[in-house]
């Protein structure tokens, strides 16, 4: 009932945010109109018009990006509990760590927002309307890729290493992360780990990273990637790879052989499918069905606490 | 493909101790929690034991009715793992199965027979 | 410790028609992730057990989709449609919720 509440109280405050950003948009515009009368001139007018307009458009970009960030979150949009609740340190994961309630966010077309709210998941739905119309285009595109299996050969799963990592300047919940996955580049990260990981730990660290995802703005930065971690209600955990990887190591499945695709197409949801697959198992093994995620000849990625987990 | 074969058991008398092995091949042992798993003659399937990896310190866990009595083991580098059973009871008489699972992958022995009677 | 409760089949079950197992659980098996920790096996006459579904409902690699498991916290039921003779054995529930690991008592499928 606690969850349903909070879950309640989010609807209630982002319902008050959208009315205060629109009284705001209400202000400007009429400013702006007054302005544009006083200066007296049609091009003036014009001139403020279209001003107006990017600010809209900016605006609505903002909200999609703040959308798309939680689509992408493996939050599954917080459904009602239903069942009987559960006491959560009886799991076999004897383990497990209670902790206050969850974000991770990350990027491309899944963040890891652990936790949404009713709002979130309306302008979810929106952006993804909008995001059919561009991607029937690219289906025909793409199309040469639907005769491949949905399973997590489809992912392109790499080690990485953070080299910096800093909070987002505008959003408390985030990291925005410089990861070197092998590439000439470092890849920009966005992850919602600020409530689950201390920034010290987050230097440095070897990580596992989904590349395929299609980049997504989050609050206004590009993420390229997504940190992959072991979550539960209660907890989240950065999966570790094995000891000896490098940067750029590929993860393969000795179960499921074959090619990731360039970029995930965020229409045909492959990630979607295949992420209620991937569980930490009993002993805190990152899985695919049950097929550890391995780096060949090095070993297996692991939660350093979490057993039968989700990963996202 | 994946093999786990039991051996050790056999024929003892209240009291007495017994040690049974499992030998296992085709998966990364090290990398996998190991169970045992007992079934008396037509009846159903118990849990006995369960031994964790060493990245989890080895952890052990036990059914009540063996705790402290049996002891669950493993070597990683022969890829066994061992089940010692002390002071065993008549009610201890069971096929004992060595298994491993990993969702969509679980592994079981063809089982060992101990046989506990005076 | 978890108490796993299974029920009787009205055997033999005719060859074709489908069948339903039950399983009852002394406490709920669904973990505030949204996942059930249960388990079916089967132990077919002679052999060692393997495992058919895991978390409820998903299939373990290789089992006909004629098996499906479903269930609420407590209550759960594996449904074999059309029933086939490879299908003979004890049915066994089993829950990883909490340790002790605990089975059900197992239910008989026989076939006419």
């Known amino acids: 009932m606690a969850n349903n509440d909070a879950v309640l109280k989010r609807l209630e405050q982002k319902g008050a945010e959208a009315d205060q950003i629109i009284e705001y948009l209400k202000q400007q515009v009429s400013l702006l109109k007054e302005k544009a009368i006083l200066q007296a001139t049609l091009r003036e007018e014009k001139k403020l018009r279209v001003e107006n307009a990017k600010l809209k458009k900016e605006i609505e970009e903002l909200k999609q990006e703040l959308i798309q960030a939680e689509i992408q979150n493996g939050v599954k949009q917080i459904p009602f509990p239903s069942g009987t609740p559960l006491h959560a340190n009886s799991m076999v994961s004897e383990n497990v760590i209670q902790s206050t309630a969850v974000t991770t966010v990350s990027s491309g077309t899944k963040e890891q927002i652990k936790g949404g709210t009713g709002d979130e998941k309306k302008a979810k739905e929106k952006i993804e309307k909008k995001g059919e119309k561009k991607e029937k285009k690219q289906q025909s595109i793409a199309g040469s890729a639907d005769s491949k299996p949905i399973d997590v050969s489809r992912l392109d799963l790499r080690i990485g290493c953070i080299i910096t990592a800093r909070k987002h300047p505008d959003a408390d919940s985030l990291y925005v992360e410089e990861v070197d996955v092998g590439e000439i580049a470092p890849r920009t990260v966005v992850s919602g780990l600020v409530n689950h990981v201390p920034l010290e730990q987050m230097q440095n660290r070897m990580v596992i990273l989904l590349c395929n995802l299609k980049p997504a703005k989050m609050r206004g930065v590009l993420s390229q990637a997504m940190v992959m971690c072991a979550s539960s209600p209660e907890k989240i955990e950065i999966l570790a790879p094995p000891n000896g990887s490098v940067p750029g190591d590929r993860i393969t499945f000795d179960a499921f052989p074959g090619e990731p695709d360039k970029e995930l197409n965020p229409k045909k949801k492959i990630w979607e499918q295949i992420q209620p697959d991937l569980h930490t198992n009993d002993e805190c093994v990152a899985t695919y069905k049950g097929v550890p995620f391995e780096v060949k000849g090095k070993g297996v990625c692991r939660a350093q606490t979490m057993s039968n987990s989700g990963i996202k | 493909a994946v093999h786990l074969v039991e051996s050790g058991g056999g024929f003892v008398q209240p009291t007495e101790s017994l040690k049974i092995s499992c030998a296992a091949s085709?998966?990364?042992?090290?990398?996998?929690?190991m169970y045992w798993v007992r079934q008396a003659p037509g009846k159903g399937l118990e849990w006995v034991a369960r031994?964790?990896?060493?990245?989890?310190?080895?952890?052990?866990y036990y059914a009540d009715s063996v705790k402290g009595r049996f002891t669950i083991s493993r070597d990683d580098s022969k890829s066994m793992v061992y089940l010692q059973m002390d002071n065993l009871k008549t009610e201890d008489t069971a096929m004992y199965y060595c298994t491993s699972w990993s969702y969509d992958f679980d592994y079981w022995g063809q089982g060992v027979m101990v046989t506990v009677s005076s | 410790d978890i108490v796993m409760t299974q029920g009787a089949l009205p055997n033999p079950v005719p060859s074709g028609e489908s069948a339903s197992i039950t399983c009852q659980s002394s406490k709920s098996l669904l973990h505030s992730s949204g996942k059930t920790y249960l388990n079916w096996y089967l132990q077919r006459p002679g052999q060692s057990p393997h495992l058919l579904i895991y978390w409820m409902s998903t299939r373990a690699s290789g089992v006909s989709d004629r098996l499906s498991g479903s269930g609420s916290g407590t209550d759960f039921t594996l449904k074999i449609s059309s029933v086939e003779a490879e299908d003979v054995g004890v049915y066994y529930c089993q829950q990883f919720l909490e340790y002790p690991l605990t089975f059900g008592s197992g239910t008989k499928l026989e076939i006419k």
């Open positions: 085709g998966f990364t042992f090290s990398d996998a929690a």
């Open positions: 031994i964790r990896t060493k990245p989890n310190n080895y952890a052990t």
